[in-house]
Amino acid sequence: PPRGRILGGREAEAHARPYMASVQLNGAHLCGGVLVAEQWVLSAAHCLEDAADGKVQVLLGAHSLSQPEPSKRLYDVLRAVPHPDSQPDTIDHDLLLLQLSEKATLGPAVRPLPWQRVDRDVAPGTLCDVAGWGIVNHAGRRPDSLQHVLLPVLDRATCNRRTHHDGAITERLMCAESNRRDSCKGDSGGPLVCGGVLEGVVTSGSRVCGNRKKPGIYTRVASYAAWIDSVLA
């Protein structure tokens, strides 16, 4: 099943997020992703856990998954690099870099997103944008077009309360509020964008969605700048 959904969001403006990628398995949307360099897409490591025998590709320049669009192009993956410390049973280090078979053709609908390199927490309350093609309601309806939602960043102390994530949120993770509006599983690997800069990647751990006591968890890209740089180099 696809790993991702946006709950309580709305359809995104077409091609207004030219960094947005759909990581696909055997031609079907699996996870979100974000173009961080001409030939590299950042996503979540857990996305490829069940993809051993399948064909992984990356769709760029898309708004609709099914309709023809001039900017849409499907790229093969030359190399998949999960973070060496990612493990199936934890949400830690849940990052994946996908090297496209060739440099993406850039244009108004396909453009890398600057990512945060300064390793400081985003201020609580900051409104950040998360987008994806995941399921849009609890009944499991999958959207054809890209959805998005604005979410306020939640401070780590609150997120780590026993009633919330009970200490699981390390310095390398961040949280966003999840009161009816939320990202979830199937949007894993997608971008959390604050002030036009990539700050987080949706983690792909299983979690109840849209419940304010179970905030959304995102991997802080700034904490992994050294690893990202070392792979992209």
Partner: antibody
């Protein structure tokens, strides 16, 4: 054989600048990332920063941002580091280094230059 | 910045012995730790990367391991040529940082 050959020792006055070089051989220079590391006698190692030769991107340790400037001349396969406003604290051995390994992730260093000794004295 | 602490500045051992050199990270660094050997007058030489992967040509008497934020370099069957400084390095996040070093002395 992959090698990094560094320029000779430098003696400089306080307040002056020095520019040292690191010449690579045995591999495709323009596709690698050259890091610089400082070592003072009897002390540990300090990472200064790097220059990615593929895209000319530099990343500095904040501590050295106003001290070091990293450049390269790809035509001669040579990387340079200029240290400015020298003080006695800058007296040290400076090594260039890079990761050759086929692992292709993580900034560890399996090729090192022999080092350039900088002495700052009035 | 992540601080890498090598508690023992000096360690003394005998040829044939087994010695454990430790390094503690001030916060989680995953397995992104390397170990280097530096003999007098030489540049550092890599021994181990990703906590436990031995670099090409490094004798198998050198092994690396981890428990949480504690990292160890074990040298079994110490040889006289192992007399050197040993440094750990984390490369999980910027700035990359090194331990202060442990000088291994042969009795």
């Amino acid at each position: 054989q992959v090698q990094l050959q560094q320029s000779g020792a430098e003696l400089a006055r306080p307040g002056a600048s020095v520019k040292m070089s690191c010449k690579a051989s045995g591999y495709t220079f323009a596709t690698y990332t050259i890091h610089w590391v400082k070592q003072r006698p009897g002390q540990g190692l300090e990472w200064i920063g790097y220059l990615n030769l593929r895209n000319d991107y530099t990343h500095y340790n904040q501590k050295f941002r106003d001290k070091a400037a990293l450049t390269a001349d790809k035509s001669s396969s040579t990387a340079y580091m200029q240290l400015s406003s020298l003080t006695s604290e800058d007296s040290a051995v400076y090594n260039c280094a890079f990761r050759l390994g086929n692992d292709r992730q993580g900034w560890y260093f399996d090729v090192w230059g022999a080092g350039t000794t900088v002495t700052v004295s009035s | 910045d992540i601080v890498m602490t090598q508690a023992h500045r000096f360690m003394s051992t005998s040829v044939g012995d087994r010695v454990i050199i430790s390094c503690k990270a001030s916060q989680d660094v995953g397995t992104a730790v390397a170990w280097y050997q530096q003999t007098p007058g030489q540049s550092p030489k890599i021994l181990i990367y990703w906590t436990s992967t031995r670099h090409t040509g490094v004798p198998d008497r050198f092994t690396g391991s981890r428990s949480g934020t504690d990292f160890t370099l074990t040298i079994s069957n110490v040889q006289s040529e192992d007399l050197a400084d040993y440094f750990c390095q984390q490369y999980t996040t910027y700035p990359l940082t090194f331990g202060g070093g442990t000088k291994l002395e042969i009795k």
